[in-house]
């Protein structure tokens, strides 16, 4: 069964401060007012949930206070930012979108964004 289409960039490079941003866009087959967005990380064959937010169309995404994710929404686009990334967090980050309300329920899963994180070199001590 053809799932709801979700598009996300193939590759993103995190900033030197360990911040990565990407857009997750979905083709809504319905008239959803409540949408759930989940970021999953796939490493080898293991899948873990990075963060999740439910939002009402036209409103802001609300992640939990201790979440490493923030985001904004505009129509069928979600701008996601993941913070506090380190080199060991390099991996495939998958955007999952669920249209929760009103029914019918739809689910779509992106192909994933490969996020590369390079730890910054420590600054050498400087003598003045």
């Amino acid at each position: 069964c053809k799932a709801m289409h979700v598009a996300q960039p193939a590759v993103v490079l995190a900033s030197s401060r360990g911040i990565a941003s990407f857009v997750c866009e979905y083709a809504s087959p319905g008239k959803a007012t409540e949408v759930r967005v989940t970021v999953l990380r796939q490493a080898d064959s293991q899948v873990t949930e990075v963060c999740a937010a439910t939002y009402m169309m036209g409103n802001e995404l609300t992640f939990l206070d201790d979440s490493i994710c923030t985001g904004t929404s505009s129509g069928n686009q979600v701008n996601l930012t993941i913070q506090g990334l380190r080199a060991m967090d390099t991996g495939l980050y998958i955007c999952k979108v669920e249209l929760m309300y009103p029914p019918p329920y739809y689910l779509g899963i992106g192909n994933g964004t490969q996020i590369y994180v390079i730890d910054p070199e420590p600054c050498p001590d400087s003598d003045f």
Partner: antibody
């Protein structure tokens, strides 16, 4: 109240075709896909495919692509499934169900028996 | 197609007990999984959608969990009315069902 009313049980001969129906009521017909599911005796469920009344688009399980044809009549809010070149392997209960990516209401099922 | 393997095939438990049914996918399905309940002589009913969401009208004694390849349906405080066959369903690609778990009361 959402209802999916199937056509009655049918007995058909091998090699023949049959068209079964599913009359939907109690909701906006074009808002939901109509899925069809096969339940063979003593076996698990098999998804056959869906048709989306809003656009007329459909998608099939590859296994049933040459066996089943799904159609809808929006004016009568009825979905149809035609099964062709029937064999004893096609004897089963066939359910229609509405949904997007979850089938939240199911009809009672139509029993199709293929026998000479 | 993605193969869904359900276990156990049958299960007998006492009223008030908690039981768990497992569903394994042959590849990652990222929570794209539904659970259905089919009582004897009735049509299947949606129980859990999207791995964790309880369908309207279903008892909160039912809960779903899992991510990746392994999924679980937990039934707490078992009732006689829970006697049924439970099916998991993958909703990625070609939809496929598990073989079913028949739950009986001791």
């Amino acid at each position: 109240e959402v209802q999916l009313q199937p056509s009655g049980p049918v007995l058909v001969k091998p090699g023949a075709s049959v068209k079964i129906s599913c009359k939907a009521s109690g909701y906006t017909f074009t808002d939901y896909k109509i899925h069809w599911v096969k339940q063979s005796h003593g076996k698990s469920l098999e998804w056959i495919g869906y048709i989306y009344p809003y656009s007329g688009s459909s998608d099939y399980n590859q296994k049933f692509k040459s066996k089943a044809t799904l159609t809808v009549d929006n004016s009568s809010t009825t979905a149809y499934m035609e099964l062709r070149s029937l064999t004893s392997e096609d004897s089963a209960v066939y359910y229609c169900a509405r949904g997007g990516d979850a089938m939240d209401y199911w009809g009672q099922g139509t029993a199709v028996t293929v026998s000479s | 197609d993605i193969l869904m393997t359900q276990s156990p095939a049958s299960l007998s438990a006492s009223v008030g007990e908690t039981v768990t049914i497992t569903c394994g996918a042959s590849e990652n399905i990222y929570g794209a999984l539904n659970w259905y309940q089919r009582k004897q002589g009735k049509s299947p009913q949606l129980l859990i959608y999207g791995a964790t969401n309880l369908a309207d009208g279903m008892s909160s004694r039912f809960s779903g969990s899992g991510l990746g390849r392994q999924y679980y349906l937990k039934i707490s405080s078992l009732h006689p009315d829970d006697v049924a066959t439970y099916f998991c369903q993958n909703i990625l690609g070609t939809w496929t069902f598990g073989g079913g778990t028949k739950l009986e009361i001791k």
